[in-house]
């Protein structure tokens, strides 16, 4: 029966399956080069010590080479999200050599067994760039392992046992179960590779995170803070499922990082950025949208290296699906006064107004308690390009902090019926886009007028004196 | 040219075993992996399982796990389908199909395997 | 496990038109879609994969297109070989799963 913990317990359960496999004395590791997108072509299986596979299979030397690497298996064949993956890597990089890392055999196991596997199956794709290093023209520079869940860490050991120093490594969603705090040589690390890029989507804190939650590259990516995706609650992936399994909502998460990754391939005119940001819940009040001093990075294959950073987290919103691009906003609204506001917390409410395209209303999510005669910042984002803003619309309601809360306002009400209505004032917005670095300063269209009740609106346009507060020249980054 | 080859048809009894082979050629049977369908009279197709040759791992629908079981022999290249206690809802077309490499399309088919459960 | 709705149990169409059919999964599939036709006493034929993608003898009159929840087979002139049964099915995750089939006859 399932955990407390809701998904993770189900699926706690699988983990520790055992399962039924006849075994047999064969290579447990092999290398197909995925010569052609056609599914149905069988590719060629590289061999140790065998050049001509490579000399018949047209293996381009000089190219870039990728190692795409599978996890743990139920099912002992490959899931959908592999074609896909070989299919963009082909799109994107015509000449480069593709190869799938099948570990099946092995990867088919209890997953503890799988996990003990890791390391000789690292040590087989390491024997084999070995191997391709003393051919002329090869270069470990040009290779790229990809790996995903459980194959993350198996590219770690591969990165780690290899003569030399591979180009990149790039972590989707590594395995967390058996890896979480392990040493820096007994998971994917940063000294793996010259590069390591990892995107975490399945974390949490409680309950069995399927994917792992610290920070085991370079830069470690966290969309939607690494861990409920979009497009993958219950009602999205159970949907109108007749027997739909809570394995469903887990495999959408944890494979969302592949799903990134190939849009990062295929969508390359529609990058996704991350921006660097000590947690999740300072990114969700829109504090790190900086790209200064190399804070703001393409995320997937367009990552821009930053060996300099270690254990970078970064964080970005996504789309439920591709292309997952949306664009960021950091709002800084100064709330001047309070009016009879009791004990109600106000939730505000914003529409943009931009010169290809309209916002939809967009709350506003309170991290903290909104404070007055402050400023306080959030983060909004859009699904679509709205182009430079000209104005905001903002409203909002009164959300009561509790029963209790409710019923004192309520008598409050009752006592004293003419009570004047409860307002907030706010004179102007702070606009800056993730996107763009531009930072803009929207003023009440009416200054007389910048009190506000709940339901109504207020109107803000573009302040008259300039794109921008003085003290704030800073002039637009350019993006990596 | 690739060629699947199904054993021939089936009369059985209620909760008596069938068991369906499928014989491969013209390709390398431990690069792709085996499926079974089946197609009882008038009805969609329904996916009851596969098997990777190379090593003779195993997923099943949930629906068929206790009942069946699919296994190979690669030194003859063929795949096998037992079902067990049957029953007249069985009765039906059983097909094997080649996946593709990722497993996920069946390009070749097998004739299919007529099994007849009654009493 | 994802149900696969092929709205039309039966479609009429004159030989020489275009014939859509359509296929609707409960939830978002992505490209892991396969059209398949089968004739009586046959057993089925593929005819696209991985929702667009052709294969290799496949007359090109037949086409597909669609991505997540909806999908669509086109044959652009229908030929009197072409009215037969046509399914479709995914592999986005287990079980795999058919459409219940879409019958093309003869208007």
């Known amino acids: 029966s399932p955990t407390p913990f809701g998904p993770e317990g189900q699926l706690a359960d699988e983990l520790h399956k055992p399962k039924a496999i006849q075994t047999e004395v064969k290579p447990s590791v092999r290398f197909n080069l995925r010569t052609s997108k056609d599914p149905e072509h069988e590719g060629c299986y590289l061999s140790l010590g065998h050049s001509q596979p490579l000399e018949d299979c047209g293996f381009n030397m000089t190219a870039k080479t990728f190692f795409i690497i599978h996890g743990w298996t139920m099912s002992g064949i490959f899931e959908n999200w592999l074609h896909k993956l070989v299919s963009a890597l082909h799109t994107r990089e015509k000449d480069a050599n593709v190869v799938v890392v099948d570990w099946l055999p092995l990867a088919h196991q209890l997953y503890t067994d799988a996990v003990n596997n890791t390391r000789v199956v690292g040590h087989s794709i390491a024997r084999m760039l070995d191997w391709l290093q003393e051919k002329d023209d090869f270069s470990l520079g040009n290779v790229h392992l990809i790996g995903y869940s459980l194959g993350a860490h198996v590219a770690g050991y591969a990165g780690n046992f290899v003569k030399g120093t591979v180009g990149r490594i790039t972590g989707l969603d590594p395995a967390g179960p058996m890896f979480e705090g392990a040493d820096i040589h007994k998971r994917l690390s940063p000294d793996d590779a010259d590069f390591v890029d990892v995107l975490h989507t399945y974390t949490r804190s409680f309950g069995l995170s399927i994917g792992i939650q610290m920070p085991v590259g370079h830069i470690d990516i966290y969309p939607n803070g690494g861990d409920f995706q979009p497009g993958c609650g219950l009602n999205d992936v159970l949907g109108s499922m007749a027997y739909g399994t809570i394995t469903e909502v887990v495999k959408c998460e944890h494979e969302r990082a592949v799903h990134l990754f190939v849009d990062s391939l295929v969508n390359q005119d529609k990058p996704s950025f991350a921006f660097q940001c000590t947690d999740s819940n300072r990114f969700k009040k829109g504090i790190c949208l900086s790209c200064r001093k190399n804070r703001c990075n393409s995320i997937g294959y367009n990552a821009k290296k930053m060996r300099n950073k270690r254990n970078s987290k970064m964080y970005l919103k996504t789309r439920a699906g591709m292309p997952f691009r949306v664009y960021h906003y950091q709002m800084k609204i100064h709330v001047f006064s309070y009016k009879n506001m009791g004990e109600i917390e106000p939730t505000f409410y914003v529409t943009l107004y931009g010169t290809n395209a309209d916002s939809q209303t967009l709350p506003l999510e309170i991290v903290e308690r909104i404070e007055q005669n402050a400023t306080n910042t959030f983060l909004v984002y859009t699904e679509e390009d709205l182009g430079d803003l000209l104005k905001i619309q903002l409203t909002w309601e009164g959300a009561s902090q509790s029963w209790y809360n409710l019923w004192k306002e309520l008598r409050s009400y009752l006592s004293q019926p003419h009570n004047p209505g409860r307002e907030l004032n706010i004179r102007r917005i702070r606009v800056k886009s993730g996107e763009t670095q531009r930072k803009l300063t929207f003023c009440a269209e009416d200054p007389e007028n910048t009190s506000i009740s709940p339901g109504r609106e207020l109107w803000f346009r573009k302040c008259r004196d300039g794109w921008r507060m003085k003290n704030e020249t800073s002039p637009t980054v350019e993006l990596p | 040219q690739v060629q699947l080859v199904q054993s021939g048809a089936e009369v059985k009894k209620p909760g008596a075993s069938v068991k369906v082979s499928c014989k491969a050629s013209g390709y390398t049977f431990t690069d792709y992996t085996m499926h079974w369908v089946r197609q009882a009279p008038g009805q969609r197709l329904e996916w009851m399982g596969g098997i990777n040759p190379y090593y003779g791992g195993t997923t099943y629908n949930e629906k068929f796990k206790d009942r069946v079981t699919i296994t190979r022999d690669t030194s003859a290249s063929t795949a096998y389908m037992e079902l067990s206690s049957l029953r007249s809802e069985d009765t039906a077309v059983y097909y094997c199909a080649k996946g593709d490499y990722y497993g996920g399309s069946y390009n070749y088919w097998g004739q299919g395997t007529t099994v007849t459960v009654s009493s | 496990e994802i149900v696969m709705t092929q709205s039309l149990a039966t479609l009429s169409v004159s030989p020489g038109e275009r014939a859509t059919l359509s296929c609707r999964a409960s939830q978002d599939i992505s490209n892991s879609l396969h059209w398949y036709q089968q004739k009586p006493g046959q057993a089925p034929r593929l005819l696209i994969y991985?929702?667009?993608q052709s294969i290799s003898g496949i007359p090109a009159r037949f086409s597909g297109s669609g991505s997540g929840t909806e999908f669509t087979l086109t044959i652009s002139s229908l030929q009197s070989e072409d009215f037969a049964v046509y399914y479709c099915q995914q592999s986005n995750s287990w079980p795999y799963t058919f459409g219940q089939g879409t019958k093309l006859e003869i208007k």
């Open positions: 991985y929702a667009s």
